[in-house]
Interface confidence: low
């Protein structure tokens, strides 16, 4: 639907389901007035998830969407939701008329054109419908991971997509495990990537009017075994009041199967360390990474005896990592008192 003076949907009633998804082409500079719901009880208008204010150049007011003069940045997805509910009364996309023949990625509208839409529109060269989802150009992934490249596009007639690897047609026939092409999702999926999958992957989207392409770079990292990596700052020094519950958190990354222990440092015969140089510890919790919530240590109804140093210890076949934090327990009757706990220790 190309407007000459003003775009308007009348009457202001909830549309039938057939009307619920629409695409409207609006010429630059033209005013827009769209309605949904009944005048006094009209729905709220949203653009790209943000509710429109009742005043301003683009406004949602008494069930009406009003744009004084249509600009390129006004293109996008608009929703009208019924008052007091999340029922969608209108779901439409406004497209800039002046960019109909453009294939410049930067000027393409952000929204996805539904090919099943019943409204007629002129021929249009392919364009990216979600360029923001294509911003990650370099994909560096560990060997064995799954990689998915997407080039969501639209146009009229509906364009086709094909893929190139390092400039050559790519169908994955020489790749162990093959590839999955999901044309309706404009995607290429490769499972269990290996170093030979490294390269430049190009999506080529074309129709009778024009074509566009985009390059993704894939680097496959050979995973080197290493000792577990613990997220810095965890577990964190914590202060709690007697009787309260405490959670200490430890985030572990390990390529090799890790085992995790939560330890509390204790004193035996007035000493914190044994003859072997190791601290005396009490094992509070031990498991592997697959165990439920092993990365969290729960301390219920803490007392003064629970105060002290706690260590999250993670080990695998390569080595060992551990980080410690201090729990300070304050007396219930004096919550203003604080003690300076020693810094958390980060040890090799």
């Amino acid at each position: 639907l190309e407007a000459s003076e003003e775009v308007e949907l009348e009457p202001c009633l909830a549309p039938s389901l057939e009307q619920q998804e629409q695409e409207l082409t609006v010429a630059l500079g033209q005013p827009v007035r769209l309605c949904c719901g009944r005048a006094e009880r009209g729905g709220h208008w949203y653009k790209e998830g943000s509710r429109l204010a009742p005043a301003g150049r683009v406004r949602g007011w008494r069930g009406r969407l009003e744009i004084a003069s249509f600009l390129p940045e006004d293109a996008g997805r608009y929703l009208c939701l019924a008052r007091g509910s999340m029922i969608v009364l209108q779901n439409l996309t406004l497209i800039t008329g002046d960019s109909l023949t453009s294939s410049n990625d930067d000027e393409d509208p952000k929204s996805h054109r539904d090919p099943s839409n019943r409204h007629s529109y002129p021929q249009q060269a392919p364009y990216w419908t979600h360029p923001q989802r294509m911003e990650k150009k370099l994909h560096a992934v560990p060997a064995g991971n799954t990689v998915k490249f997407r080039c969501p596009a639209a146009g009229n007639p509906t364009p086709t997509i094909r893929w190139l690897k390092d400039g050559q047609a790519f169908h994955g026939e020489n790749r162990i495990g093959g590839i999955r092409l999901r044309h309706q999702h404009w995607s290429l999926v490769m499972e269990s990537v290996v170093p030979s999958d490294r390269g430049t992957y190009t999506c080529l989207v074309e129709n009778a009017v024009g074509s566009i392409r985009y390059n993704y770079l894939l680097d496959v990292l050979e995973r080197s075994p290493h000792r577990p990596i613990l997220q810095a700052g965890l577990p964190a020094n914590t202060t709690a009041v007697v009787g309260s519950d405490v959670e200490l958190l430890c985030k572990v990354y390990s390529d090799a199967q890790p085992h995790i222990q939560w330890l509390k440092h204790i004193v035996i015969n007035g000493s914190s360390f044994g003859a072997d140089g190791f601290p005396y510890v009490q094992v509070l919790k031990t498991a592997d990474i697959n165990s439920s919530e092993v990365e969290v240590l729960y301390l219920r109804n803490v007392s003064a005896e629970d105060a002290g140093e706690y260590t999250c210890l993670a080990g695998n076949s390569i080595g060992l990592s551990y980080q410690s934090a201090w729990l300070t327990v304050l007396p219930e009757e004096d919550p203003t008192w604080t003690a300076a706990a020693p810094e958390a220790r980060y040890t090799d």
């Epitope: 080197s224 090799a256 330890l263 510890v281 592997d288 695998n316 076949s317 390569i318 080595g319």
Partner: antibody, heavy 121, light 110 residues
Framework: EVQLLESGGGLVQPGGSLRLSCAAS????????MNWVRQAPGKGLEWVAV????????YYADSVKGRFTISRDNSKNTLYLQMNSLRAEDTAVYYC??????????????WGQGTLVTVSS | QSVLTQPPSASGTPGQRVTISCSGS????????VNWYQQLPGTAPKLLIY???QRPSGVPDRFSGSKSGTSASLAISGLRSEDEADYYC???????????FGGGTKLTVL
């Protein structure tokens, strides 16, 4: 008690092949990286290869890359070393080794008794 | 040539203190902890020191280890005749993605 028992060593001609096995017991084999380490007569220790707990990662010393293949069968608790294109300099005692940690109190570092591979014409 | 450098030999008289050095680089000793092995003639290596300076149970306190930067050392005090053996340092090398060893030091008790 942890036990690693190597087998499959023997005399082989240059260019020939041999497959070593290592039967493991006394620990969770499937949770540990496994290694082969060799020692030529009168020489020092040389690491040969390592395989991850699930077999997905394998790394080799440059001296054996492309000729030796490390593998494992977790259902049989067995580690293997397939040795092809053998050379005189591959003559050595081959040890099956698992290295890990008894996390906190002590080491987890066990060696088999070794099996002798002799490459000679 | 070994990735880690050790002196080929060392010697001492009973009761003496002997130190064996092990030099590496940032990708091995500089990044990871060091193990020391003792190999008596005709036997498999036995772990002597792990995590730079820790002794497994059963290893006498005459054996001690230390690490500084990209070097490590093994000290044996109160030397005994049964300490006569080959000693190897070892660590993981991040660049080579494997375990590396020193060339070994033959300790002779005079």
């Amino acid at each position: 008690e942890v036990q690693l028992l190597e087998s499959g060593g023997g005399l082989v001609q240059p260019g020939g092949s041999l497959r070593l096995s290592c039967a493991a017991s006394g620990f969770t084999f499937s949770s540990n990286y496994m290694n082969w380490v060799r020692q030529a007569p009168g020489k020092g220790l040389e690491w040969v290869a390592v395989i991850s707990y699930d077999g997905s990662n394998k790394y080799y010393a440059d001296s054996v890359k492309g000729r030796f293949t490390i593998s494992r069968d977790n259902s049989k608790n067995t580690l293997y070393l397939q040795m092809n294109s053998l050379r005189a300099e591959d003559t050595a005692v081959y040890y099956c080794v698992t290295k890990s940690r008894d996390f906190w109190r002590g080491p987890f570092d066990y060696w088999g008794q070794g099996t002798l591979v002799t490459v000679s014409s | 040539q070994s990735v880690l450098t050790q002196p080929p030999s060392a010697s001492g008289t009973p009761g003496q203190r002997v130190t064996i050095s092990c030099s590496g680089s940032s990708s091995n000793i500089g990044s990871n902890t060091v193990n020391w092995y003792q190999q008596l003639p005709g036997t498999a290596p036995k772990l002597l020191i792990y995590r730079n300076n820790q002794r497994p149970s059963g290893v006498p306190d005459r054996f001690s280890g230390s690490k500084s930067g990209t070097s490590a050392s093994l000290a044996i005090s109160g030397l005994r005749s049964e300490d006569e053996a080959d000693y190897y340092c070892s660590t993981w090398d991040d660049s080579l993605r494997g375990w590396v060893f020193g060339g070994g030091t033959k300790l002779t008790v005079l």
